[in-house]
Interface confidence: medium
């Protein structure tokens, strides 16, 4: 069956900036700003666009070792990102895949709302475990707040054509342009 769970959460970060950091450059940011949640993100195939496969590894102590995500759609105009969890983690005998949609919408106060849809594709008559949904939601919230904190502390980061000092992230300085960002996609 297919079980659809939706939620929304808010952020003080403007939609365009949050999309760049949280979605387009999450692969780089997550292990650095939230190492307790994600230890590494490895590009298995593709250049970040639809069809790209990524392996996300989790630190020891978490229930799962890794998941593999497939990028399905990246919409830079509507700040929308679709991807599916296709291997590892909860995927197995009872769960075929999890299709996810994240949409970031601007709010009148200059912040944004993240609208998140998770479709759990189960095998046969199996149902989705409530704790799995809860864990997934908590992971997303952890990553969002870590990225949000980083952006609040680094006002120049992920603004168009700004020089970002990545020393705090353990890297070197680099110019992040719109073009560069299109090569980095994640949830």
């Amino acid at each position: 069956g297919v079980f659809n769970y939706e939620t929304e959460t808010t952020s003080v970060i403007p939609a365009a900036r949050l999309f760049k950091a949280f979605i387009l450059d999450g692969d780089n940011l997550f292990p650095k700003v939230a190492p307790q949640a994600i230890s590494s993100v490895e590009n298995i195939e593709g250049n970040g666009g639809p069809g790209t496969i990524k392996k996300i590894s989790f630190p020891e102590g978490l229930p799962f070792k890794y998941v593999k995500d497939r990028v399905d759609e990246v919409d830079h105009t509507n700040f929308k990102y679709n991807y599916a969890v296709i291997e590892g983690g909860p995927i197995g005998d009872t769960l075929e895949k999890i299709s996810n949609e994240i949409k970031i919408v601007a709010t009148p106060d200059g912040g944004s709302i993240l609208k998140i849809s998770n479709k759990y594709h189960t095998k046969g008559d199996h149902e989705v475990k409530a704790e799995q949904v809860k864990a997934s939601k908590e992971m997303g919230e952890t990553l969002l707040r870590a990225v949000e904190s980083y952006l609040l502390a680094h006002s120049d980061a992920y603004n168009e054509q700004k020089l970002i000092s990545e020393e705090d992230l353990g890297g070197e300085q680099k110019l992040i342009s719109e073009e560069d960002l299109h090569h980095h996609h994640h949830h």
């Epitope: 769970y5 808010t10 609208k115 849809s117």
Partner: antibody
Framework: EVQLVESGGGLVQPGGSLRLSCAAS????????MSWVRQAPGEGLEWVSV???????YYSDSVKGRFTISRHNSKNTLYLQMNSLRTEDTAVYYC?????????????WGQGTMVTVSS | DIQMTQSPSSLSASVGDRVTITCRAS??????LNWYQQKPGKAPNLLIY???SLQSGVPSRFSGSGSGTDFTLTISSLQPEDFGTYYC?????????FGQGTKLEIK
């Protein structure tokens, strides 16, 4: 049964205040985003305010600074505090639940409570 | 703000007719378009969510379609109980906005 029941409407003079309540049963108010929507006599629907499950609130420009949306988790009740009321606030006020499954559509509505602002 | 414009504002149709109501948005968005039916003196009732998904308990003669800025509600074979006012609504961005309504009367 999942339902919403509004109360607190009535006749009030311009400049006065009212507090509307919306008692929920069959689900937890704090787990869903909740909105207030109003309908002036003979008119269409107008969204008034929302409180997201995380507690963030937003208002339409027409009520901003005058109305306050809130919720009481243990009473499982949504509120709309309306101050500095104007004649144009006269309407039936509905509380509505945002579905967690149906892309933010308002899937459950109360029966409405009438607010009349008149001298 | 996203403005929602419905047409027609009213219409009269006979039982068995195919009825179409359109809704145009002032800016493009996807998925977050809903349709409600309201009968006199009653609260609105959700018919269609996410542009084309039928709300549980709603008869299959109701359907929704569209994308971008143009959306449509169709009643394939009008029934006597389908009278009332129909509203489109976008739940994509705040402030959430409704169309002005389409009043449907049965001939």
């Amino acid at each position: 049964e999942v339902q919403l029941v509004e109360s607190g409407g009535g006749l009030v003079q311009p400049g006065g205040s009212l507090r509307l309540s919306c008692a929920a049963s069959g689900f937890t108010v704090s787990s869903n985003s909740m909105s207030w929507v109003r309908q002036a006599p003979g008119e269409g629907l107008e969204w008034v305010s929302v409180i997201f499950s995380g507690g963030i609130t937003y208002y339409s420009d027409s009520v901003k600074g005058r109305f306050t949306i809130s919720r009481h988790n243990s009473k499982n009740t949504l509120y709309l505090q309306m101050n500095s009321l104007r004649t144009e606030d006269t309407a039936v006020y509905y509380c509505a639940r945002h579905s967690n499954w149906n892309f933010d559509a308002f899937d459950i509505w109360g029966q409405g409570t009438m607010v009349t602002v008149s001298s | 703000d996203i403005q929602m414009t419905q047409s027609p504002s009213s219409l009269s149709a006979s039982v068995g007719d195919r009825v179409t109501i359109t809704c145009r948005a002032s800016q493009s968005f996807d998925t977050y378009l809903n349709w409600y039916q309201q009968k006199p003196g009653k609260a609105p009732n959700l018919l269609i969510y996410a542009t084309s998904s039928l709300q549980s308990g709603v008869p299959s003669r109701f359907s929704g379609s569209g994308s971008g800025t143009d959306f449509t509600l169709t009643i394939s074979s009008l029934q006597p109980e389908d009278f009332g006012t129909y509203y489109c609504q976008q739940s994509y961005s705040i402030p959430y906005t409704f169309g002005q309504g389409t009043k449907l009367e049965i001939k």
